[in-house]
Interface confidence: low
């Protein structure tokens, strides 16, 4: 790990990454891009998942929280020889597959997925994968493109969930590096703090959710804060403001001191949460206090 | 068994109010989108509007957004299509329907609608 | 106006195949359904997802999906597929649900 910005979010990461022909030279920059992004992403809570397309995609790595298994999933990752065609919606459908079965405790884990192709998908190739990115989307899943050398960013703006979640590396692949810290910062949703983290026990409290990201939603009216009660009911609330660094919610009332809400934040009308280690917790409080 | 169960349609003066609901049984109506589509005597089927499971996100079509609104309780199990200003335009057969696959209404993903009410008429006259 | 276009009217003799279709911009990116209504009563979707068949529904019915046409095939047509047929997708802004004008089928 090098230090520099870190992602505390606790969310599903999938790398989608091209294999095909075209990259045969260039895996290297690939396989550092990667290795050098995954680190910075540091929760305990995040999982990851390497998939690689060709003329068919393949999950490198399932998903795992397991830092062991991650290292090692880097291992094969470098190993791999690419070769064949661009059948990017291989990739996603790897990716949705898993996002499909990966229930944590009954609901959703947010899902992030960086895909990274070098060239222009043509038609069929192209529609197929947009209809894939999007199968994801309705998972619940975030997609950012990267588009390196002979890309078409009007086709990854499509397939990405907006032309601001497009990554452009116009100078060639060894230009990889340089992006690594916007990306960081994009697809990063992270909780780190609800204040207060203490509320009276039977009254009624707004929190203010600090954190980053939230206005990374494609569409902030469907932003949610939730709160799983004592590792059982999970209660959602509209917050009144969505700003990127905080989030403005009605607490719940929690009537008996001593309850425990861990606090989540789901990015798609309550479809799938990010997870965060925030509790927030009832104590007594006198009157006039 | 999953069904939809409708009621409140009937006959309205033109510019009055009307509310109609839809019973939802078999299934847990918080976990789906769900819509609601009209039928003008003779015509073919309009979308009106629709919902995202949680009742975050709604959606109308040009044709009634600002009259309409749609809404659910879903401890009831129940959505509802509010109608203000009503117009003889708007006399149809209204269905209320349960949108396929995840609840959150994304719109890229729109496969179907895979359950229907028995519809109810609304005629809307003086 | 409809996004989606359909012919108004086709028939095919019993035991025969028949295919409706429905054109529109939007399908180019997006899913066609198709529904089943007959007199008096609720549609009943038979087609999802472009070619997904709900169950229940039998197996001479099939749907496909071509460039911005989406089409719907009844092979060995019955007295009991007589009904009117709708195509449906979102439109393509992305916002809305948009069905077609409508195909009246009759079995000869």
């Known amino acids: 790990e090098d230090g520099g910005p870190a992602c505390y979010g606790g969310f599903d990461l999938y790398f989608i990454l091209d294999k095909s022909g075209s990259v045969l030279h260039h895996w290297n920059e690939i396989y550092y891009f990667v290795e050098q992004l995954a680190h910075k992403f540091i929760s305990p809570q995040l999982r990851m998942s390497f998939i690689v397309f060709s003329t068919r995609g393949t999950t490198l790595m399932k998903l795992t929280e397991d830092r062991e298994q991650i290292r090692q999933g880097l291992e094969e990752l470098q190993k791999v020889l690419p070769g064949g065609d661009t059948y990017m919606h291989e990739g996603f459908e790897r990716a949705s597959e898993q996002i499909y079965y990966e229930n944590r405790q009954g609901y959703r884990t947010a899902s992030v997925i960086i895909a990274l192709t070098d060239g222009e998908l043509h038609e069929d190739l192209f529609f197929y994968s947009e209809r894939e990115a999007n199968r994801s989307r309705d998972l619940g899943a975030i997609v950012y493109c990267v588009g390196v050398k002979d890309f078409n960013e009007t086709q990854l703006a499509r397939i990405a969930d907006s032309k601001d979640h497009v990554f452009p590396v116009n100078d060639g692949f060894q230009a990889l590096q340089g992006i690594i810290h916007s990306i960081l910062k994009k697809s990063c949703i992270e909780i780190l703090a609800a204040e207060p983290s203490t509320i009276c026990a039977g009254e009624s409290f707004q929190v203010v959710v600090r954190g980053n990201g939230f206005r990374h939603a494609r569409n902030v009216d469907r932003v949610l804060c939730s709160f799983k009660i004592n590792d059982s009911v999970t209660l959602n609330e509209k917050p009144f403001s969505v700003e990127d660094t905080y989030l403005l919610c009605p607490a719940p009332i929690l009537k008996e001191v001593g309850m425990k809400a861990a606090l989540q934040v789901s990015m798609n009308d309550g479809l799938s949460f990010i997870s965060s280690s925030v509790i927030i917790t009832t104590t007594h409080c006198s009157d006039g206090s | 068994q999953v069904q939809l169960v409708q009621s409140g349609g009937g006959v309205v003066q033109p510019g009055r109010p009307l509310r109609l609901s839809c019973a939802a049984s078999g299934f847990n109506l918080g976990s789906y989108a769900m819509s609601w589509v009209r039928q003008a005597p003779g015509k073919g089927l309009e979308w009106v509007s629709a919902i995202s499971g949680s009742g975050g996100s709604t959606y109308y079509a040009d044709s009634v957004k600002g009259r309409f609104t749609i809404s659910r309780d879903n401890s009831k199990n129940t959505l509802y299509l509010q109608m203000n200003s009503l117009r003889a335009e708007d006399t149809a057969v209204y269905y209320c329907?349960?949108?396929?696959?995840?609840?959150?209404?994304?719109?890229?993903?729109?496969?179907?609608?895979?359950?229907w009410g028995q519809g109810t008429t609304v005629t809307v006259s003086s | 106006s409809s996004e989606l276009t359909q012919d108004p009217a086709v028939s095919v003799a019993l035991g025969q195949t028949v295919r409706i279709t429905c054109q529109g911009d939007?399908?180019?990116?997006?899913?066609a359904s198709w529904y089943q209504q007959k007199p008096g009563q609720a549609p009943v979707l038979v087609i999802y997802?472009?070619?997904n068949r709900p169950s229940g529904i039998p197996d001479r019915v099939s749907g496909s999906r071509s460039g911005n046409t989406a089409s719907l095939t009844i092979t060995g047509a019955q007295a009991e597929d007589e009904a009117d047929y709708y195509c449906n997708s979102r439109d393509s802004s992305g916002n809305h649900v948009v069905f077609g004008g409508g195909t009246e089928l009759t079995v000869l």
């Open positions: 329907a349960k949108i396929l696959g995840p609840g959150n209404l994304n719109y890229y993903y729109y496969y179907g609608m895979d359950v």
């Open positions: 939007s399908l180019r990116n997006s899913y």
């Open positions: 997802g472009n070619n």
